[in-house]
Interface confidence: medium
Amino acid sequence: QPSVSPGEPSPPSIHPAKSELIVRVGNEIRLLCIDPGFVKWTFEILDETNENKQNEWITEKAEATNTGKYTCTNKHGLSSSIYVFVRDPAKLFLVDRSLYGKEDNDTLVRCPLTDPEVTSYSLKGCQGKPLPKDLRFVPDPKAGITIKSVKRAYHRLCLHCSADQEGKSVLSDKFILKVRPAFKAVPVVSVSKASYLLREGEEFTVTCTIKDVSSSVYSTWKRENSQTKLQEKYNSWHHGDFNYERQATLTISSARVNDSGVFMCYANNTFGSANVTTTLEVVDKGFINIFPMINTTVFVNDGENVDLIVEYEAFPKPEHQQWIYMNRTFTDKWEDYPKSENESNIRYVSELHLTRLKGTEGGTYTFLVSNSDVNASIAFNVYVNTKPEILTYDRLVNGMLQCVAAGFPEPTIDWYFCPGTEQRCSASVLPVDVQTLNASGPPFGKLVVQSSIDSSAFKHNGTVECKAYNDVGKTSAYFNFAFKGNNKEQIHPHTLFTPRSHHHHHH
């Protein structure tokens, strides 16, 4: 007996053998699926599906909602379909009013017809308003009307499906198009503060603001170089269409030193990503660091001004500042101000303005500052440079001539003899004795020097000059001598004290 090789399996046959069938409302729908391996009938319209395991599908009284695609499937998974229109003059459109469109994509207005023989199947604006000029659509009686390349401007557009039935225009229920925007830029991210400085145990809270066109933007706080999931809270707001804002707040209720580091707020959408960082520094205790803006040893000339300036870092903020001299606190002449008005500022400046300083006002000037955790201070040693002043010039009973001068820096005393009536004293005389009188006294006052020469060395009439000088200037005093026979006489009443010109020395 010859063997018969079976052919390829074929799809089922449907009776009536048409691709489309029009049935009047109230009439019967009778569809027969012919296939030895029949499995089921499936009916689909909009989001509705029904199944029937009988090979004959019978709907005794057809309704408009029976319009749709009827598919017969066999055991090989092959199928055949017929589309049935149930013509109902009272219900021209089947509608699913949910209408979402993704920007730049096509979207389907789901209003399939129950009568394929109507004309002018199209979209119309609500209340007679025209559709946007650039709106393009493609009608399909079995599916609805496809809007091509949805624009953001179509959001909240109200429209109807429309068709002419027996010369009259019929409108479907209204549709409101909701446009889901496409991401065309990376999210905009910002942070409440770029850096935070806290003490251990204080709360760290930082807010990242993410702005984008829709809420499907992704955002998270991350710790740099760490995979640990951070605890964050979200606030979110729609500030109108396509204007979405989210606030992601990261909180560490009791910060520890090892929480210090860089925290990144990261956001992304389908277009790309963006991030912003903030730095946290946690210290176990507050601190103050003082930086002198001038040398702490200051030399200033008599009568001149000087400003003592410090910059300092203080965290927490400084509570008490003062300038002190000789155990006295300045109530004026100083100012203290933040280096910047930035909320995160920890740097401050303090200035003490000393004016027309006298020789007696040298000494230690101290700046003290404190906050709730620590105290700190810095001292300036101020030396006032003064021209020598000759305090005394005498002929002692033992025949010595003595000159005492004071000034800062320490004066040097030189002696000169002028024979006769010469005005220029050039011959220098070596002193017998030189002493610094107050070297062990206060360190910042004028220094007193005493110098003596032996007057018995002078054999002629003349003048003796005592000249005291330092870096600032010089001062001279004179002793006049006259010989009467063999007696030498110092003429005190006519002794001249003539300050000479002095020069300033600036440091």
């Epitope: 809420s215 964050e232 809270k233 979200y234 606030n235 979110s236 707001w237 729609h238 500030h239 109108g240 804002e245 989210r246 606030q247």
Partner: antibody, heavy 123, light 108 residues
């Protein structure tokens, strides 16, 4: 001080329309959202929707979308809740409540409430 | 939408601590607030941003929120605290939702 004063009680028949109001004072009305909250007799609070008076941007709870309309007139610092066709099931106390703006530390709390408007719908 | 579940009632003796819970899927990731409503009155905010108290609210009211549960705690409960309490959260889409409410009864 901040105050939200609501319009008086209403008795209506099914199918009638209604518009109730909520007037804000003592703060910048345009910068705070106004929410509407329903409380049916003996029941809990239900959030209906919210409006930002500055630009009249509204958001509705899915349960109330299409059932009511929320609006505002910033020139008179007043928000409104309206129905085009009342049903017996709309009988309830309706509260308006102020919601601080997005950047506020107290978001999203309803920090001040009106005294409520009782709406009774009965044939 | 998020659903919030509260116990219908909680009873407490005067001076004792009352805890009212509010559970919902991952509500710890958003802020919770709590409202007190006495009969015939409008609700009053008692806790916002999980654990912050508005001015004028006694210190005995406190809140917490993590995981799937927010909790309102009233320590040293007083007779005047007897009321209905509602929790509320607002989701990413800015839709707010209230819990079903808890009737707090102060015994005695």
């Amino acid at each position: 001080q901040v105050q939200l004063v609501q319009s008086g009680a209403e008795v209506k028949k099914p199918g009638e329309s209604l518009k109730i109001s909520c007037k804000g004072s003592g703060y910048s009305f345009t910068n705070y959202w106004i929410a509407w909250v329903r409380q049916m007799p003996g029941k809990g609070l239900e959030w209906m929707g919210i409006i930002y008076p500055s630009n009249s941007y509204t958001l509705y709870s899915p349960s109330f979308q299409g059932q009511v309309t929320i609006s505002a007139d910033k020139s008179i610092s007043t928000a409104y809740l309206q129905w085009s066709s009342l049903k017996a099931s709309d009988t309830a106390m309706y509260y308006c409540a102020r919601v601080p703006p997005g950047g506020s530390i107290s978001y999203p709390a309803f920090d001040h409430w009106g005294q409520g408007t009782l709406v009774t719908v009965s044939s | 939408d998020i659903e919030l579940t509260q116990p219908p009632s909680v009873s407490v003796s005067p001076g004792q601590t009352a805890s009212i819970t509010c559970s919902g899927d991952n509500i710890g990731s958003i802020y919770a607030s709590w409202y007190q409503q006495k009969p015939g009155q409008a609700p009053v905010l008692v806790i916002y941003r999980d654990n912050k108290r508005p001015s004028g609210i006694p210190e005995r009211f406190s809140g917490s929120n993590s995981g799937n549960t927010a909790t309102l705690t009233i320590s040293g409960t007083q007779a005047e605290d007897e009321a209905d309490y509602y929790c509320s959260v607002t989701d990413m889409e800015q839709h707010s939702v209230f819990g079903g409410g808890t009737k707090l009864t102060v015994l005695g």
